[in-house]
């Protein structure tokens, strides 16, 4: 058993049928010695008396808010949560496996630049009685500071019969140098509590590996005289690291017809313009990627050919 | 990524082309190592990220773009001093800091070159003959060093008398390649920045 926060405790259980569970001793936070009784949740049934209460915690029915009283007055509370270990592996019931970029990916994180700011998100089908708490650091043995905000519900989607909820959090490394060569990964730890179930999820990454630039901005077409060709131009996104001559991007320009089956013409360039043939009803899209370290491509910025 | 490669203008900063080749070569070598050594811990998540140039050179700090010198987090100690006379310094704009930067890059390349050559000698003794260093990568390191053209004492190639542990050597190869790729990215950024300025 360990303390998650004041008066909230996590009991770690080897989770299998007929498991013996864990013996837990609760102590009433009071100078009183006599006349103390214990109850669980809203029940008035007295579980025991005395300054300490010894319980055998086996299942969720044994978890909850234990309260010690004296003469009708509440003295203190202890909330017991359960953390299930199933055959040597901590349970992952609360969050959905996003399966991208690989199986058992519960937290996904992205950064728009090298400033040390990043966003993480996760999915669940649970809509109520759910709380998250996020901590982060650079390295784990001698951790350096990363400050995270509160996790917020950022999207709701319908997936078949189920509703899916997306939560996200923004974090910022306290003293980040955009040009630094990372040797220690960022660690992100999310505590999730659903009713009386506790779970924790972690992700470890280098900022360089989660970079995904914003799409190029100010995408414009300029027709070339006496030609079906157009000059496409764009600019670096505002959120990208500066100077751009140091943090350079490379671009992919795509001409896509109305039909998804039509052949796509693609050009790769390091410049912020390109000359392409604009077909009728086609659209031109441009996306960006770090020129020197191949992390994710940005989403496409698009304009119609007409 | 197999993308069309632009050839640099003749007037371009002479080292840019070499640094682009270096990044391409080390990235290819790392990809080859990860595929060949699939049963070894060779991915970024599995290896320890060591930097053989730590406390010996200070490339990131010496080559910091002017725009980032206002960022206190970027200004670690710059204690290392280097010899300055290099042929990449083709323009009158060359400052002491630029010379320091380029000579730090040269020192990095020299250190990695020695490590890679020593390691290749060990790998050639492996009866499994599983993996060797790409000669193209070694040649590209050499070309960039020549383009930088700094006078510096030659570091003797390390020779070891004990029987090599090939498992450890292959893991060290992965560690070195990951670190060198990160340094090659920094070198490419620096060359691109110097070329633009």
């Amino acid at each position: 058993i360990w303390e998650l926060k004041k008066d909230v405790y996590v009991v770690e259980l080897d989770w299998y049928p007929d498991a013996p569970g864990e013996m837990v001793v609760l102590t009433c936070d009071t100078p009183e010695e006599d006349g103390i009784t214990w109850t669980l949740d809203q029940s008035s049934e007295v579980l025991g008396s005395g300054k300490t209460l010894t319980i055998q915690v086996k299942e969720f029915g044994d978890a909850g808010q234990y309260t010690c009283h004296k003469g009708g007055e509440v003295l203190s509370h202890s909330l017991l949560l359960l953390h299930k270990k199933e055959d040597g592996i901590w349970s992952t019931d609360i969050l959905k496996d996003q399966k991208e970029p690989k199986n058992k990916t519960f937290l996904r994180c992205e950064a728009k630049n090298y400033s040390g700011r990043f966003t993480c998100w996760w999915l669940t089908t649970i809509s109520t009685d759910l709380t998250f708490s996020v901590k982060s650091s650079r390295g784990s043995s001698d951790p350096q500071g990363v400050t995270c905000g509160a996790a917020t519900l950022s999207a709701e989607r319908v997936r078949g019969d189920n509703k899916e909820y997306e939560y996200s959090v923004e974090c910022q490394e306290d003293s980040a140098c955009p040009a630094a060569e990372e040797s220690l990964p960022i660690e992100v730890m999310v505590d999730a509590v659903h009713k009386l179930k506790y779970e924790n999820y972690t992700s470890s990454f280098f900022i360089r590996d989660i970079i995904k630039p914003d799409p190029p901005k100010n995408l414009q077409l300029k027709p070339l005289k006496n030609s079906r060709q157009v000059e496409v131009s764009w600019e670096y996104p505002d959120t990208w690291s500066t100077p751009h001559s140091y943090f350079s991007l490379t671009f992919c320009v795509q001409v896509q017809g109305k039909s998804k089956r039509e052949k796509k013409d693609r050009v790769f360039t390091d410049k912020t313009s390109a000359t392409v043939i604009c077909r009728k009803n086609a659209s031109i899209s441009v996306r960006a990627q770090d020129r020197y370290y191949s992390s994710s491509w940005s989403e496409w910025a698009s304009v119609p050919c007409s | 990524r197999n993308l069309p490669v632009a050839t640099p203008d003749p007037g371009m900063f002479p080292c840019l082309h070499h640094s682009q080749n270096l990044l391409r070569a080390v990235s290819n070598m790392l990809q080859k190592a990860r595929q060949t050594l699939e049963f070894y811990p060779c991915t970024s998540e599995e290896i320890d990220h060591e930097d053989i140039t730590k406390d010996k050179t200070s490339t990131v700090e010496a080559c910091l773009p002017l725009e980032l010198t206002k960022n206190e987090s970027c200004l670690n100690s710059r204690e290392t001093s280097f010899i300055t006379n290099g042929s990449c310094l083709a323009s009158r704009k060359t400052s002491f800091m630029m010379a320091l930067c380029l000579s730090s890059i040269y020192e990095d390349l020299k250190m990695y070159q020695v490590e890679f050559k020593t390691m290749n000698a060990k790998l050639l003794m492996d009866p499994k003959r599983q993996i060797f260093l790409d000669q193209n990568m070694l040649a590209v390191i050499d070309e960039l060093m020549q383009a930088l053209n700094f006078n510096s004492e030659t570091v003797p190639q390390k020779s070891s008398l004990e029987e090599p542990d090939f498992y450890k050597t292959k893991i060290k190869l992965c560690i070195l390649l990951h670190a060198f790729r990160i340094r090659a990215v920094t070198i490419d950024r620096v060359m691109s920045y110097l070329n633009a300025s």
Partner: antibody, heavy 115, light 112 residues
Framework: QVQLVQSGGGVVQPGRSLRLSCAAS????????MHWVRQAPGKGLEWVAF????????YYADSVKGRFTISRDNSKNTLYLQMKSLRAEDTAVYYC????????WGQGTMVTVSS | SYVLTQPPSVSGTPGQRVTISCSGG????????VKWYQQLPGTAPKLLIY???QRPSGVPDRFSGSKSGTSASLAITGVQAEDEADYYC????????????FGTGTKVTVLG
């Protein structure tokens, strides 16, 4: 004490269907994940499928994906394996089993796919 | 499709020490714990070892398990006639959990 009693095995022709059941008692069935494991005659153990405690997630071996469906009825304390498009290579003893560091196995039920 | 490799058979005389190996990889045994089962003819498997080296109550102490790197082993010190059975190791792969990964199985024969 924990008990898993299996039923539903038998002889079936290729291409036909069969449903296996596993009745649980002696524990809170709705709190634990469950597996199906099979063993072809004279061969080793092969995992078939898993279902979460609440039925929210199901996992299958590639060899049965799209043909077998694992399900559970927590109100009846029963686990099921619906097997469709049966093939000769599905002939085996099928076991249900609890998920956890200490596990309990059913007695096994024989499924024979033969024309 | 077995990822965990065991020797097909091992044998020993009563009282001898018999060991069975189970060889896997970084993503299974290297990452997760190992279990060992004993299966007597015509019966369901019985758990002998869980968590690499833990014995459930009721399992004789002549059975012991260990794990090192990407391999595990089961030792029977002072093998007895009633130990003649098939033995299976089991683990999980970090990418496909909760799918059970079983070893190929080892037939233990107790001679004469």
């Amino acid at each position: 004490q924990v008990q898993l009693v299996q039923s539903g095995g038998g002889v079936v022709q290729p291409g036909r269907s069969l449903r296996l059941s596993c009745a649980a008692s002696g524990f809170t069935f709705s709190s634990y994940g469950m597996h199906w494991v099979r063993q072809a005659p004279g061969k080793g153990l092969e995992w078939v499928a898993f279902i979460r405690y609440d039925g929210s997630n199901k996992y299958y071996a590639d060899s049965v994906k799209g043909r077998f469906t694992i399900s559970r009825d927590n109100s009846k304390n029963t686990l099921y394996l619906q097997m469709k498009s049966l093939r000769a290579e599905d002939t085996a003893v099928y076991y249900c089993k609890t998920h956890g560091s200490h596990d309990n196995w059913g007695q096994g039920t024989m499924v024979t796919v033969s024309s | 499709s077995y990822v965990l490799t065991q020797p097909p058979s091992v044998s020993g005389t009563p009282g001898q020490r018999v060991t069975i190996s189970c060889s896997g990889g970084r993503s299974n045994i290297g990452y997760n714990t190992v279990k060992w089962y004993q299966q007597l003819p015509g019966t369901a498997p019985k758990l002998l070892i869980y968590g690499n080296d833990q014995r459930p109550s009721g399992v004789p102490d002549r059975f012991s398990g260990s794990k090192s790197g990407t391999s595990a082993s089961l030792a029977i010190t002072g093998v007895q006639a009633e130990d003649e059975a098939d033995y299976y190791c089991q683990s999980y792969d970090r990418g496909t959990h909760p799918a059970l990964l079983f070893g190929t199985g080892t037939k233990v024969t107790v001679l004469g």
